[in-house]
């Protein structure tokens, strides 16, 4: 396993919002991660988060299969060789209907300042 510092992610932005899907963009150092681990959690519910991963070379992904007019918290981490970054989160409200598709309604995003070393 790598013993070097794992660089943190930059910023995460919801680029497009639809009624049942959205597009997530983020920034990260080139070549730093094997993949990104993304969790999509419906707010105010005990339902399990939707988990997915994206290859480390990508900086955006579509997130399908969401509910209309629903608040979600989306968390992203960069992962490489036994390391994971501090999670970066964004909250979003999906559109209320088929025709109500609009540019990013990003409520907030926040990041930690240290990487996590998993033992």
């Amino acid at each position: 396993a790598s013993t070097g510092e794992t660089p943190n992610l930059g910023e995460v932005v919801v680029a497009e919002v639809g009624w049942d899907a959205l597009k997530l963009n983020w920034t990260a150092p080139e070549g730093a991660y094997e993949y990104f681990f993304i969790q999509v959690q419906e707010a105010d519910t005990v339902e399990a988060a939707q988990n997915l991963t994206v290859p480390g070379g990508l900086r955006s992904t579509d997130l399908p299969g969401l509910k209309a007019a629903t608040h979600y918290t989306i968390t992203i981490r960069g992962v490489t060789q036994d390391f994971s970054t501090t999670p970066l989160s964004v909250e979003v409200l999906t559109a209320s209907g088929l025709n109500d598709i609009f540019e990013a309604q990003k409520i907030e995003w926040h990041e930690g300042t240290h990487h996590h070393h998993h033992h």
């Epitope: 049942d20 993949y35 681990f37 988990n51 997915l52 299969g65 992962v79 060789q81 036994d82």
Partner: antibody, heavy 121, light 107 residues
Framework: QVQLVQSGAEVKKPGSSVKVSCKAS????????ISWVRQAPGQGLEWMGG????????NYAQKFQGRVTITADKSTSTAYMELSSLRSEDTAVYYC??????????????WGQGTTVTVSS | DIQMTQSPSSLSASVGDRVTITCRAS??????LGWYQQKPGKAPKRLIY???SLQSGVPSRFSGGGSGTEFTLTISSLQPEDFATYYC?????????FGQGTKVEIK
């Protein structure tokens, strides 16, 4: 070269539990997902669940929710699948696998040799 | 869970035939869709990943296509060694799901 080596065949009584192990060697264990897939005699492949050891939390297919528990021990590079309340329909070959698309983007998929679980009274 | 409906469940074909197998997802999925070939008593073997990328070492007669909810595996000219069972797997959204399988038999 990654190898996934599973525990041996099991014969179980209905209502009991079985725990199958899958030891990984030849590569990083913690950051790559391990899935469990089963195949009953003459039937298709069923994805049961999977885990990324570095995060610890597992995903389960709805069909097995509440009856299956998938865990991973990073210190021994071993994943486990425990299935409870066994019935005859659970008689199958159980595979652990590293499958492309979720926390793994390697050139090849890797499969364990399979563990036959027979449920019979 | 996302349902993957695979069709047909079985088909009979001759050597040299063009064969197409379809997988339909119950909702839009990311294109993390793989196709696997399985022969009796063996573990499955990946043929296609990311819906259309050919696995290294797999003959070019195999091809994949589709996006969103509908995906296809095509064998352009069936060979004797291709008689097997084929499965699709969506592994882009958890929990992952296999299709029910398509058994390709000799006519």
């Amino acid at each position: 070269q990654v190898q996934l080596v599973q525990s041996g065949a099991e014969v179980k009584k209905p209502g009991s539990s079985v725990k199958v192990s899958c030891k990984a060697s030849g590569g990083t264990f913690s950051s790559y997902a391990i899935s469990w897939v089963r195949q009953a005699p003459g039937q298709g492949l069923e994805w049961m669940g999977g885990i990324i050891p570095i995060f610890g939390t597992a995903n389960y297919a709805q069909k097995f929710q509440g009856r299956v528990t998938i865990t991973a021990d990073k210190s021994t590079s071993t994943a486990y699948m425990e299935l409870s309340s066994l019935r005859s329909e659970d008689t199958a070959v159980y595979y652990c696998a590293r499958l492309y698309g979720y926390a793994y983007y390697g050139a090849f998929d890797y499969w364990g040799q399979g563990t036959t679980v027979t449920v019979s009274s | 869970d996302i349902q993957m409906t695979q069709s047909p469940s079985s088909l009979s074909a001759s050597v040299g035939d063009r064969v197409t197998i379809t997988c339909r997802a119950s909702q839009g999925i990311r294109n993390v869709l793989g196709w696997y070939q399985q022969k009796p008593g063996k573990a499955p073997k990946r043929l296609i990943y990311d819906s259309s990328s050919l696995q290294s070492g797999v003959p070019s007669r195999f091809s994949g296509g589709g996006s969103g909810t509908e995906f296809t595996l095509t064998i352009s000219s069936l060979q004797p060694e291709d008689f097997a069972t084929y499965y699709c797997l969506q592994n882009g959204l958890q929990p992952a799901t296999f299709g029910q399988g398509t058994k390709v038999e000799i006519k």
